[in-house]
């Protein structure tokens, strides 16, 4: 029986009965938050062989092993993951071993086994036989291996039953528990699975099979399952579903959801039955279950019941995420906020059409309206009193409407009104009249030339850069000395710079009036010598990174014909020089024969240029005699067990430290202080743990149903 779509077992261990007839769980399996220690021995689910998404275990008291619960779990497909993981075992206080002795394949995703204070038999499992890549596995804060004394079957009797593999240069026996070996297939099978008797399965099988070379005898399928057979692709008139089986059109049309209406049901696209059309596609009509490509961004019509949507916070803007057409009126009233410009762009940046009017008032946090970066049409079907469809009143810091060189905006009906916007130049408003096609509609009082732009540098001269010099982490720039009509009015210059991978930034990107600004700012005093050109050294930059830079002159608010003169440069794009890359990541080596080593690594996190090649160096090392000092198989040599607390363990030094010459004297050596890089890595590690734990809690703690 296929169970799904995802099973959540919590609070009451008897809910496990829901798994009784499941052979495949189509979706995830959560077993969590069972705080009363129970006896799980009577619960056994031998039918369960496959979980198509992920397995999550969290705070289940009394459960000591998973082997009895799921003796035949063979494959976790990881079609959808829990924070990049297909297997999560977290804060399982009594778990002593994983024990999933039939688990042969985790198709996608990594594993996270963390804060399980009593959990052993972790170092005896070779995860590389189960997962494609082990570098993303996260196994920390469990019982320290030296307190576990993990013994594979037969080692005590000196008749080892398990096979050996090499992990991190350690060639050892591989097992799940004290009496269950980790199954390995003969090398003759290659990537294929095998039966219990080591006969190779059909290539379409995954994990295991009940008979060799038979595509109907697979425990799980490598690709897709259809009508009892494992197939490489779904046959005609069937569609891939949940990454593992083939279904027909009726099946797909009959998947229900409590969250969406039947007209928003599953669709068929590109040979797959899926929940909704993928990005860039839209349903081919309201009663269709097929998708067609969108022309431009996919339309999403949003409607405000009360006709006018007030945007006075990020929360209210959030309701418009993804909307391309807004049926109604927008009233923007943003007085304060943190990082407001980029937040508004995130939630309102896709709006292309507003059917009613747009009113921006008392929005002192706004410097620009560029967060409405796709707005191209205001229909003005509903207008404010006085027939206004674009109304801008009392915005103390508004400096820019849009970048009119890259913006087409049409106001189909209605007039514009601007008043009491002291930093908004009238020239900017006149430019909007031309672009939007409203020139001639406004009467004289609609654009107030006295109280718009009264505190802005509206007549700007252009500053020209004269030289630029770069190194790997520095840029030196100079520019022409600006000479206003009265030299005393020039106070200083401000240099603005930021990383700019693409040459598409504008002065107002990410800027608001509450201190958020995506630009770094440096003040530059005037050189005392009037003949020296002003300049700056920008340092602490990243190698091989493109930066955008512009300069503004800071002038006295000297009024000339009712306007303040100012000066600024165009935006200059400049790249720092290349540098030495950081070290390659996740270096792994393994021997696959007596004369070969296979070395794998990931690219450096900071290439600092275009990587052209890697240099691999190796040297022969003498064998470490220390490895042979103890007989690790004898019980009396195993250190006394002490209960781990489930926190992250720092490896203890159990031997006397080596004595070396330190600080000019002989004596025991102190641990070297941590480098900045190590401290940073530890900080990031701790942060990553917190992020995961937050994600876990946010995902699984839900309000009780009423």
């Amino acid at each position: 029986e296929i169970c799904g779509p995802g099973i959540d077992i919590r609070n009451d261990y008897q809910q496990l009965k829901r798994l009784e007839n499941c052979t495949v769980i189509e979706g995830y399996l959560h077993i969590l938050l069972i705080s009363k220690a129970e006896d799980y021995r009577s619960y056994r689910f031998p039918k369960l062989t496959v979980i198509t998404e992920y397995l999550l275990l969290f705070r289940v008291a009394g459960l000591e092993s998973l082997g009895d619960l799921f003796p035949n779990l063979t494959v976790i497909r990881g079609w959808k993951l829990f924070y990049n993981y297909a297997l999560v075992i977290f804060e399982m206080t009594n778990l002593k071993d994983i024990g999933l002795y039939n688990l042969r394949n985790i198709t996608r995703g990594a594993i996270r086994i963390e804060k399980n204070a009593d959990l052993c038999y972790l170092s005896t499992v070779d995860w590389s036989l189960i997962l494609d890549a082990v570098s993303n596995n996260y196994i920390v804060g469990n019982k320290p291996p030296k307190e576990c004394g993990d013994l594979c079957p037969g080692t005590m009797e000196e008749k080892p039953m398990c096979e050996k593999t090499t992990i991190n240069n350690e060639y050892n026996y591989r097992c799940w528990t004290t009496n269950r070996c980790q199954k390995m297939c003969p090398s003759t099978c290659g990537k294929r699975a095998c039966t219990e008797n080591n006969e190779c399965c059909h290539p379409e099988c995954l994990g295991s099979c009940s008979a060799p070379d038979n595509d109907t005898a697979c425990v799980a399928c490598r690709h897709y399952y259809y009508a009892g057979v494992c197939v490489p692709a779904c046959p005609p008139n069937t569609y891939r579903f949940e990454g593992w089986r083939c279904v027909d059109r009726d099946f797909c049309a009959n998947i229900l959801s409590a969250e969406s209406s039947d007209s928003e049901g599953f669709v068929i696209h590109d040979g797959e039955c899926m929940q909704e059309c993928p990005s860039g596609f839209i349903r081919n009509g309201s009663q269709s279950m097929y998708c067609i490509p969108c022309e431009g961004p996919c339309p999403k019509v949003c409607e405000e019941e009360k006709k006018t949507k007030t945007i006075d916070s990020v929360t209210s803007a959030q309701m418009l995420q993804g909307c391309t057409i807004f049926k109604g009126n927008l009233l923007i009233n943003i007085r304060r906020g943190n990082n407001i410009a980029s937040e508004l762009e995130n939630f309102m940046g896709l709006i292309e059409v507003v059917t009613g009017y747009v009113k921006i008032r008392h929005s002192h946090a706004l410097v620009s309206l560029s967060f409405l970066k796709n707005l191209r049409l205001i229909l003005g079907e509903e207008q404010l009193e006085g027939n206004y469809s674009f109304y801008v009143l009392d915005n103390q810091n508004l400096q820019q409407l849009w970048d009119w060189d890259h913006r087409n905006l049409t106001i189909k009906a209605g007039k514009m009104y601007f008043a009491f916007n002291p930093k908004l130049c009238v020239s900017e408003i006149y430019r909007m009249e031309e672009v939007t096609g409203t020139k001639g509609r406004q009467s004289k009082g609609d654009i107030n030339t006295r109280n718009n732009g009264e505190r802005a540098s509206c007549e700007s001269d252009v500053l020209h850069f004269t030289s630029t010099t770069t190194s790997k982490n520095r840029i030196i720039i100079t520019w022409h000395r600006y000479r206003p009509p009265d030299y005393r009015d020039l106070i200083s210059f401000t240099v603005y710079y930021k990383e700019a991978p693409f040459k598409n930034v504008t002065e107002y990107d990410g800027q608001d009036a509450c201190g958020s600004n995506s630009w770094n700012m440096v003040d530059v005093d005037l050189p005392p010598n009037k003949d020296v050109e002003p300049g700056i050294l920008l340092h602490g930059l990243k190698p091989w990174t493109q930066y955008a830079v512009y300069v503004k002159a800071v002038t006295l608010t000297m009024v000339e014909n009712d306007h303040i003169r100012g000066a600024k440069s165009e935006i200059l794009y400049i790249r720092t020089n290349a540098s030495v890359p950081s070290i390659p990541l996740d270096v792994l080596s393994a021997s696959n024969s007596s004369s070969q080593l296979i070395v794998k690594w990931n690219p450096p996190s900071l290439p600092n240029g275009n990587l052209s090649y890697y240099i691999v160096r190796w040297q022969r090392q003498p064998q470490d005699g220390y490895l042979y000092r103890h007989n690790y198989c004898s019980k009396d040599k195993i250190p006394i067990r002490k209960y781990a607390d489930g926190t992250i363990d720092i490896e203890e030094v159990t031997e006397n430290p080596k004595t070396e010459v330190c600080g000019g004297e002989k004596g025991p050596c102190c641990a070297c202080p941590k480098t900045e890089a190590e401290k940073q890595a530890e900080k990031e590690e701790a942060e990553y743990r917190k992020v995961f734990e937050n994600f876990l809690h946010n995902s699984i703690f839900v309000p009780r149903p009423e």
Epitope: I2, G4, P5, E26, D250, C252, S263, Q287
Partner: antibody, heavy 118, light 107 residues
Amino acid sequence: EVQLVQSGGGLVKPGGSLRLSCAASGFTFSSFAMHWVRQAPGKGLEWISVIDTRGATYYADSVKGRFTISRDNAKNSLYLQMNSLRAEDTAVYYCHRLGNFYYGMDVWGQGTTVTVSS
Amino acid sequence: EIVLTQSPGTLSVSPGERATLSCRASQSIGSSLHWYQQKPGQAPRLLIKHASQSLSGIPDRFSGSGSGTDFTLTISRLEPEDFAVYYCHQSSRLPHTFGQGTKVEIK
């Protein structure tokens, strides 16, 4: 011929249990969501439950926690397990294959009577 | 849940006349509304699906219209066999719901 044949109705005491069955034929049973609808004597139709093709189940508030819908695709059968029965559960119960939003015709079982009385 | 309200509760019409039945949803359900006819002792029979889609085998005197919250079933010329109870049913959102029914009787 597409048809649904029901069985399992009868007289039961309040607090008792009953299991209704619905055998499907003439179509690919596993490819359709299946519903249960009931009609109390002299009253209108009341939708009570559905199980979709993935096995996801949904219930009306009036039966939630007491009734369980299930299916066995291998046997082409739909079931309704009714526990903690009350007098107000007395009705004719129909199994129903609703023509989905896009395709498929509407099919009803013949109905089976459940009487809850002491 | 979405509440469907049918009106009138009872409609008295003479054979050959036109009958108009109304169904109103408590919130928008798009076109996910179906009309059923039920005669005593029988299972319901689907007449119109998705507000206006006619079905093969159903006489073309039955027609449906509407979308969103207001829907209408029209029987253009009542035949003797049309006197029955008519139900609307929404499948837009779970739980599905039925209207309370409209009884069409001979005047």
